[in-house]
Interface confidence: low
């Protein structure tokens, strides 16, 4: 059988190392060799490459080498197939080595910010040693900023010959770092180079790009000073390298700039003391080159009524998210705030807040909370300068068994009956929400019975019990994830009523 | 006062793990970055790597990497550096030191601890 | 890794004289080096940053100078108390580097 004809004749011309065309089918049933025909000089040379050796036998590459590589050229290649049976030849195939030629990567030596020159890089590099001098060069670069995995390109051409280039890259985030790679091919090649080594640089730093802030309203105090605890970080959409040195608040009554205060901190929180008036505050952040934008909260009366537009809330998992969603009655209100915090005994130690614009949900990450923590979230509807009144809900991201069972014990101890009271197990404890309790009781060598009621109940009346019996009882705790047992205790029911009993003294 | 106060000298066997503190008072460290370096017996400075308190971006120098893990707690303003599989290469005075990343420089500079690696 | 080549690496100067230490880059740094002291059993002590800018409260007997590759830290009138061990730095790309530290001592 004669071998099939060699197609998809593809070759490629690697500057100044060799010219390789490969071909279809890369294996033969048979053994084949394999005679690629070349024309070169613009068709006054001719010669052969051939796969006839042990070592390329069988093998649909084949490479011509130098001194013979001539450029600029046009080539024609033909493939010859020859098997014990015969000959196969391809169709001819024409080659423009300006149009397949592949030269090696630039390298980048320098990715610089220009004193001056805002949101911009200078990417330096040098041409590749072996890019025909002469020649146009077409480039891609690709960046990115050093935490996403989303490339942008842009492409350019450079006719100049010296070998150190420059590239300006505008138009990027202040105090950013990106991440940098190039390529080039010459102006007419379909083949690009491989892509640089990525290097690194950092856009000029730019006075803050602005806050976010936020409240939390504290009851009054004796005295009447209402604490209010500000927070402020960077807004959203600022650069991840920015750095404040510090903050500037300033605050006054509403209608009485006289009054107004000012606090410089480091810190991103500051707790003001407010008389019962409104209030404005401001605050702006500021580096070594000047100020942010002023980010503006007003701080109602104390006896201000507000609004409310949140008629329900519910809190959902996804595999790895947590999603709350709230219903509303008020279309013109598009931004909220989100507070969430752990619920615990003690005064939470992180509080954490967001902006919610132009939608009714809110979506966190499970990693970012605490497995077997309840976590407190409320949503605060904004509209223009007044906060409305916040609708609440808990959730926990994970659930398991409570750490500690209900602390039990038994009063009001009867003949056939006794009530058993329960303590509600500390928060920090719970690891889920409560969902119902189950008393195990248990007469001496008898059978057990269990009795189980709603998560609001601590106290349970027990009947139909056997006079002067001891019984063994402990209450369960559960959560979506199990239960817990309480300590066990032991009573036992009395022979006679002591009300009974006392009447019968009495005659 | 403006100061980093790091925790005392150690004493570790090879193959062991060292965590060094650093406490920074006078200065919230959400607002720097936090660098490590050390220094061997009659030898140079090298620098290990750079934690921003702010979010826990760490780097860290190539000859370190895998080896030392930079933490920072906010709440106490404390930085801390982890060197595990502890050799006699790793004896050594460890500094952290406050960078102000508008400033470009270490202004503040911990006491040092020293750490022995001896079987 | 950019390696940084101080010299000399020691100096023995007499009060009142000048005192000249440079340090070399393998690559430019554009000016991003900073020049430290450390006194035996002390940390390093900022003098100069960016190459030329010195830190507050540095005398100006202190001076730095230098771009791209070569910088050089200039000490005049030398008083007793400049004896220490003097390293420069790049902050221009990660790992950063010191030079191996230049020991002044007074004569």
């Known amino acids: 059988v004669l071998p099939a004809k060699p197609e998809n004749i593809s070759c490629i011309f690697y500057y100044e190392e060799n010219f390789t065309c490969t071909w279809s089918p890369e294996k033969e049933a048979s053994y084949t060799w394999y005679k690629v025909k070349r024309t070169y000089s613009y068709g006054y040379k001719s010669d052969i490459c051939s796969t006839d050796n042990s070592t390329r036998g069988n093998h649909a590459s084949c490479s011509f080498l130098p001194p013979t590589i001539t450029n600029p050229d046009n080539y024609t290649i033909q493939v010859e197939a020859q098997n014990a049976d015969g000959i196969m030849k391809s169709d001819i195939t024409y080659w423009n080595l300006d149009a397949i030629m592949k030269i090696e990567p630039p390298e980048i030596f320098s990715v610089k910010s220009v004193l001056g020159i805002k949101r911009m890089l200078q990417i330096k590099w040098i041409r590749p040693v072996l890019a025909p001098h002469s020649s146009t060069l077409k480039y891609t670069l690709r960046f990115r900023t050093i935490n996403s995995a989303y490339w942008m390109e842009v492409n350019f051409t450079k006719e100049d010959i010296d070998r150190d280039e420059t590239y300006n890259l505008t138009e990027l985030q202040a105090f950013t770092e990106y991440v940098m790679t190039l390529r080039c091919a010459p102006a007419e090649s379909m083949f690009w180079s491989g892509w640089s080594q990525e290097k690194v640089g950092t856009t000029e730093e730019e006075a803050p790009y602005g806050l976010d802030l936020w409240r939390v309203l504290k009851p009054a105090m004796v005295d009447g000073r209402r604490p209010v605890q500000l927070m402020w970080k960077k807004a959203t959409g600022a650069p991840v390298l920015e750095k404040a040195l510090g903050y500037n608040i300033w605050y006054f009554p509403e209608n009485n700039t006289n009054l107004t205060e000012t606090v410089n901190t480091t810190n991103q929180t500051h707790e003001l003391y407010l008389g019962g008036k409104t209030y404005w505050v401001y605050v702006v952040s500021y580096n070594s080159l000047g100020e942010s934008p002023v980010a503006t909260l007003r701080i109602p009366a104390l006896n201000e009524k507000t609004f409310q537009c949140i008629e329900a809330m519910q809190a959902c998992l996804t595999q790895d998210q947590l999603v709350v969603e709230w219903q509303s009655s008020a279309p013109e209100v598009d931004t909220w705030m989100v507070e969430w915090f752990p619920d615990v005994d003690s005064e939470p130690s992180s509080f954490s807040w967001e902006s919610v614009s132009q939608a009714r949900n809110w979506t966190i990450q499970k990693d970012e909370l605490k497995p077997l923590w309840c976590y407190n979230i409320s949503v605060y509807p904004v509209l223009r300068d007044r906060v409305g009144q916040p609708y609440s809900t808990q959730a926990y991201v994970q659930e398991g068994i409570p750490s500690a069972g209900p602390v039990t014990q038994a009063d009001s101890i009867g003949v056939k009956t006794v009530t058993i009271t329960w303590k509600e197990i500390p928060k920090s404890k719970r690891n889920g929400f409560i969902k119902n309790y189950t008393i195990f009781y248990q007469a001496e060598d008898g059978k057990e019975f269990s009795k189980t009621v709603n998560s609001n109940i601590l106290q349970y009346r027990l009947e139909s019990l056997t006079r002067r019996t001891s019984y063994s009882l402990q209450v369960m705790a559960s959560t979506n994830a199990g239960g817990t047992n309480g300590t066990k205790i032991n009573f036992k029911t009395l022979s006679i009523s002591h009300h009974h009993h006392h009447h019968h003294h009495h005659h | 006062e403006v100061q980093l106060v790091q925790s005392g000298a150690e004493v570790k066997k090879p193959g062991a793990s060292v965590k060094v503190s650093c406490t920074a008072s006078g200065f919230n460290i959400k607002n720097t970055f936090i660098h490590w370096v050390r220094q061997a017996p009659g030898a140079g400075l090298d620098w290990i790597g750079r934690?921003?308190?702010?979010?826990?971006?760490?780097k860290y120098a190539p000859k370190f990497q895998g080896r030392a893990t930079l933490t920072a707690d906010t709440s106490t303003n404390t930085a801390y550096m982890q060197l595990s599989s502890l050799r006699a290469g790793d004896i050594a005075v460890y500094y952290c030191?406050?960078?102000?990343?508008?400033?470009?420089?270490?202004?503040?500079w911990g006491q040092g601890t020293l750490v022995t690696v001896s079987s | 890794d950019i390696v940084m080549t101080q010299t000399p690496l020691s100096l023995s100067v007499s009060p009142g004289e000048t005192a000249s230490i440079s340090c070399k880059a393998s690559?430019?740094?554009?000016?991003?080096v900073t020049w430290f002291r450390q006194k035996p059993g002390q940390s390093p002590q900022l003098l100069i940053y960016?190459?030329?800018n010195r830190y507050t409260g540095v005398p100006d007997r202190f001076s730095g100078s230098g771009s791209g590759t070569d910088f050089t830290l200039r000490i005049s009138t030398v008083e007793a108390d400049d004896t220490g061990v003097y390293y420069c730095q790049q902050d221009y790309s990660s790992p950063w580097t010191f030079g191996q530290g230049t020991k002044l001592e007074i004569k």
């Open positions: 030191a406050r960078y102000y990343y508008v400033s470009s420089y270490f202004d503040v």
């Open positions: 960016s190459a030329s």
């Open positions: 934690i921003d308190p702010a979010n826990g971006n760490t």
């Open positions: 690559q430019s740094v554009t000016n991003d």
